[in-house]
């Protein structure tokens, strides 16, 4: 099943956010990423893990999963390259770089993001937007066209107490609010941007979504930019 | 390693004020909570409050609100809890504990005597 | 606040015994989550409380696997399956799931 949702979202203006990627498997959708380079594609690392003997491609240029958009166009994979410290069991290091076969045509659709490059926390309230095709609802309903959702930054010091992440939330992650909006498994791979920046990529743990105890989990990539460079270098 | 470590004893007398601090290394000091537990001479353990080390923002459980005041040195990795106007009934160990995973992390304690 | 009532007060017990520690809520301390945060802890004569199990069941790291927890709803149990001389001490358990969190008034585990 696609590891995403989108929950209390709405749908995104169409292709608004040209950098957004849906990672495929199989020539379905399977997780969110984000263009951050002409070839290059970030997602979580999670994601490939039941992907062993499937083909997985990403798709740019995409409003829609289904109907035909002139600024659509999937690429196979030349390398898929996951942090080398990331493990199935645990929620740090969810980082993937996609190497896509070619270099993407850009356009006003298909455009790579700025990412975050200062290691320092996004301030607490600051409200970010996140994206996915993931499902809408708990009861499962997916959605054919991208949803958006603005989420407000929680500190890591309550996102850290028992009943959230139980100091589970090292300097390397951050937190989102959760309280009927909120990102989940299936958008997992997704960019969360603050300021028009990419800040976050939405993790792909096994996580309750919409309670407000339990906050969105995303990866800093401040915090990996030495390793993002050493891959597209 | 991760390490709690509170000030010494205090000996105070009732109407006093005494300010306990617990320094905390091995670990991101903001990126945790800090909780004070209180333990009676012989007696159980009581949950004070918590402050978070990212906002500053104390909360404190009903029976210590108005005296108790918890407070930050976050350059110094420092909690402090502070108690004023003294009773007898505020002789007790305090403990700081961190926030996560559980309550895992406890500084060693710290005897506060409130006797005229 | 959540009333967590332990029994017994006092345990005495020889060593290689069997342990069982009881604790009731006053209220089922189940979280919106999922999760029930009931925790139980050992502090030693003179030194702090030392966690030895969360969400009812689990080991924290480095306890020995004698200790056990189970339990649902309101009714909670620690066992020690064979009690050692390091075992000894007082025994809390403490329910995190309600603010304010709030601990038993504790079992003397001791030497018969």
């Known amino acids: 099943p696609p590891r995403g949702r989108i929950l209390g979202g709405r749908e995104a203006e169409a292709h608004a956010r040209p950098y957004m990627a849906s990672v495929q498997l199989n020539g379905a959708h399977l997780c969110g990423g984000v263009l951050v380079a002409e070839q290059w594609v970030l997602s979580a690392a999670h994601c490939l893990e039941d992907a062993a003997d499937g083909k997985v491609q990403v798709l740019l240029g995409a409003h829609s999963l289904s109907q035909p958009e002139p600024s659509k166009r999937l690429y196979d994979v030349l390398r898929a390259v996951p942090h080398p410290d990331s493990q199935p069991d645990t929620i740090d290091h969810d980082l993937l770089l996609l190497q896509l076969s070619e270099k993407a045509t850009l356009g006003p659709a298909v455009r790579p993001l700025p990412w975050q490059r200062v290691d320092r926390d996004v301030a607490p309230g600051t409200l970010c937007d996140v994206a996915g095709w993931g499902i809408v609802n708990h009861a499962g309903r997916r959605p054919d066209s991208l949803q958006h959702v603005l989420l407000p930054v929680l500190d890591r010091a309550t996102c850290n107490r028992r009943t959230h992440h139980d100091g589970a939330i090292t300097e390397r992650l951050m937190c989102a609010e959760s309280n009927r909006r909120d990102s989940c498994k299936g958008d997992s791979g997704g960019p969360l941007v603050c300021g028009g920046v990419l800040e976050g990529v939405v993790t792909s743990g096994s996580r309750v979504c919409g309670n407000r105890k339990k906050p969105g989990i995303y990866t800093r990539v401040a915090s990996y930019a030495a390793w993002i460079d050493s891959v597209l270098a | 390693q991760i390490q709690l470590v509170q000030s010494g004893p205090e000996l105070k007398k009732p109407g006093e004020t005494v300010k306990i601090s617990c320094k905390a290394s091995?670990?991101?000091?903001?990126?945790?909570?800090m909780n004070w537990v209180k333990q009676g001479p012989g007696k159980g353990l009581k949950w004070m409050g918590w402050?978070?080390?990212?906002?500053?923002?104390?909360t404190y459980a009903d029976d210590f609100k108005g005296r108790f005041a918890f407070s930050l040195e976050t350059s110094a990795s420092t909690a402090y809890l502070q108690i004023s106007n003294l009773k007898n009934e505020d002789t007790a160990t305090y403990f700081c504990?961190?926030?996560?995973?559980?309550?895992?992390?406890w500084g060693q304690g710290t005897l506060v005597t409130v006797s005229a | 606040d959540v009333l967590m009532t332990q029994t017994p007060l006092s345990l005495p017990v020889s060593l290689g015994d069997q342990a069982s520690i009881s604790c009731r809520s006053s209220l089922i301390i189940e979280h919106s989550d999922g999760n029930t945060y009931l925790e139980w802890y050992l502090q030693k004569p003179g030194q702090s409380p030392k966690l030895l199990i969360y969400k009812v069941s689990n080991r924290f790291s480095g306890v020995p696997d004698r200790f056990s927890g189970s339990g649902s709803g309101t009714d909670f149990t620690l066992k020690i399956s064979r009690v050692e001389a390091d075992d000894l001490g007082v025994y809390y358990c403490f329910q995190g799931s309600h603010v304010p969190v709030t601990f038993g008034a504790g079992t003397n585990l001791e030497l018969k």
């Open positions: 091995g670990y991101i000091f903001r990126n945790y909570g």
């Open positions: 402050i978070n080390t990212y906002t500053g923002e104390p």
């Open positions: 504990v961190r926030d996560g995973p559980g309550f895992a992390y």
